[in-house]
């Protein structure tokens, strides 16, 4: 009886998401088989979120307004290790836009779900940020400094990196 | 290349506005922030504020606060700067910069002489 | 607001000098050091950008360095077109700010 409604639960909760992932892949958290922790198909799964890499190419506003409708938000980059993951599944060739924008051009930079713009754990290229004009962070790669960050105008498409909380279940 | 052309030398009476204008060539002009310095009779360069040619909002030095407003016109390229309130000590040489990399202003225009008497 | 201070108001140089001038913040300024010659006739062109980079058709003899709060501008061969005032200026914090010039004449 008590597995009976614990299924009906999971069963309801995953119609919830079935409008925006109409599939998801789940695996079981640690020995207990009530714990199932799920990303969308064919998301990653890093730590307690999901990834999602976006080639299509959009402005910064649109890349947001693109992840919000998947009930994420562009990626916003908390560790190194979380950065060092994120970046096994990006092309060299390619700039993506993050969470990070400077709004009012005052070098005043935040994380789209507020989370505090802490200097101690950026990871911006050599002489960047640079630009008062250049109000969006994107990450890419310079051979000389591998993955970093870098400053752009918000306008000019870019892929982008969508991050969810995983799904419990 | 790249040309910043001002508007020429005004003379104004106390209490009055002026407004100057700077309009930029040779480059796209809504991809380039404009700064504005002013630089009184003998003295040094001072840093007015910055307006962002694609969204239209602007950074003031506290200082010039109240007396100082900066629009921009995209259609004609051209970026403007009134100043209200005029008094004696409002007479300057005003330029305009165009915003570049690495926090800098990498072309200026040739400077309003803007003098205040009545 | 950021302090910037050129401790030489004026400077008297034979053509062909080497000609040093300085310039320092009131705190660090990571490099966002730029400087600006002024014509006597008015006219202000960028010399050198975030400390020690050379704006496009400048000259050679011209070069900058420095770090954290102290920075300095070069002239290797004094020329007849280098009599000017030399600003420095801090890009590293708004509002921006200017050091009070140096005035570099020929002796």
């Known amino acids: 009886n008590f597995m009976y409604s614990k299924t009906v639960k999971r069963l309801s909760k995953l119609r919830e998401y079935q409008q925006y992932h109409p599939s998801l892949t789940c695996v079981m958290e640690g020995k207990d088989i009530e714990d199932w922790s799920c990303c969308p198909t064919p998301w990653t799964s890093f730590q307690s979120s999901c990834y999602f890499i976006s080639t299509g190419m959009q402005s910064w506003t649109k890349s947001q307004k693109n992840c919000s409708v998947m009930g994420a938000d562009l990626v916003v980059i908390n560790t190194r290790e979380e950065q060092d993951f994120i970046i096994q599944n990006l092309k060299r060739n390619s700039s993506y836009f993050l969470g990070l924008s400077d709004p009012g051009g005052r070098r005043h930079w935040q994380w789209v779900d507020q989370t505090p713009y802490n200097e101690n754990v950026t990871f911006w290229h050599s002489g960047e940020p640079n630009n008062l004009d250049e109000r969006c962070a994107i990450i890419n790669f310079r051979s000389s400094e591998e993955w970093g960050w870098n400053d752009i105008h918000c306008h000019v498409p870019q892929k982008s990196i969508c991050k969810m909380k995983k799904i419990y279940i | 290349q790249v040309q910043l052309q001002q508007s020429g030398a005004e003379v104004v009476k106390p209490g009055a506005s002026v407004k100057i204008s700077c309009k930029g060539s040779?480059?796209?002009?809504?991809?380039?922030?404009m700064h504005w310095v002013r630089q009184a009779p003998g003295q040094g360069l001072e840093w007015i504020g910055v307006i962002s040619t694609y969204y239209g909002d602007s950074n003031y030095n506290q200082k010039f606060k109240g007396k100082v407003t900066m629009t921009v016109d995209k259609s004609s390229s051209t970026a403007y700067m009134e100043l209200s309130r005029l008094t004696s000590d409002d007479t300057a040489v005003y330029y305009c910069?165009?915003?570049?990399?690495?926090?800098?202003?990498?072309?200026w225009g040739q400077g309003t002489l803007v003098t205040v008497s009545s | 607001d950021i302090q910037m201070t050129q401790s030489t108001s004026s400077l008297s140089a034979s053509l062909g000098d080497r000609v040093t001038i300085t310039c320092q913040a009131s705190?660090?300024?990571?490099?966002?050091l730029n400087w600006y010659q002024q014509k006597p006739d008015g006219t202000v062109k960028l010399l050198i950008y975030y400390t020690s980079n050379l704006h496009t058709g400048v000259p050679s003899r011209f070069s900058g360095s420095g770090s954290g709060t102290d920075y300095s501008l070069t002239i290797s061969n004094l020329q007849q077109e280098d009599i000017a005032t030399y600003y420095c200026q801090q890009g590293n914090t708004l509002p921006w700010t200017f050091g009070g010039g140096t005035k570099l004449e020929i002796k």
């Open positions: 040779g480059y796209t002009f809504t991809d380039y922030s």
């Open positions: 705190q660090d300024i990571s490099n966002y």
């Open positions: 910069a165009r915003n570049g990399n690495f926090y800098v202003m990498d072309y």
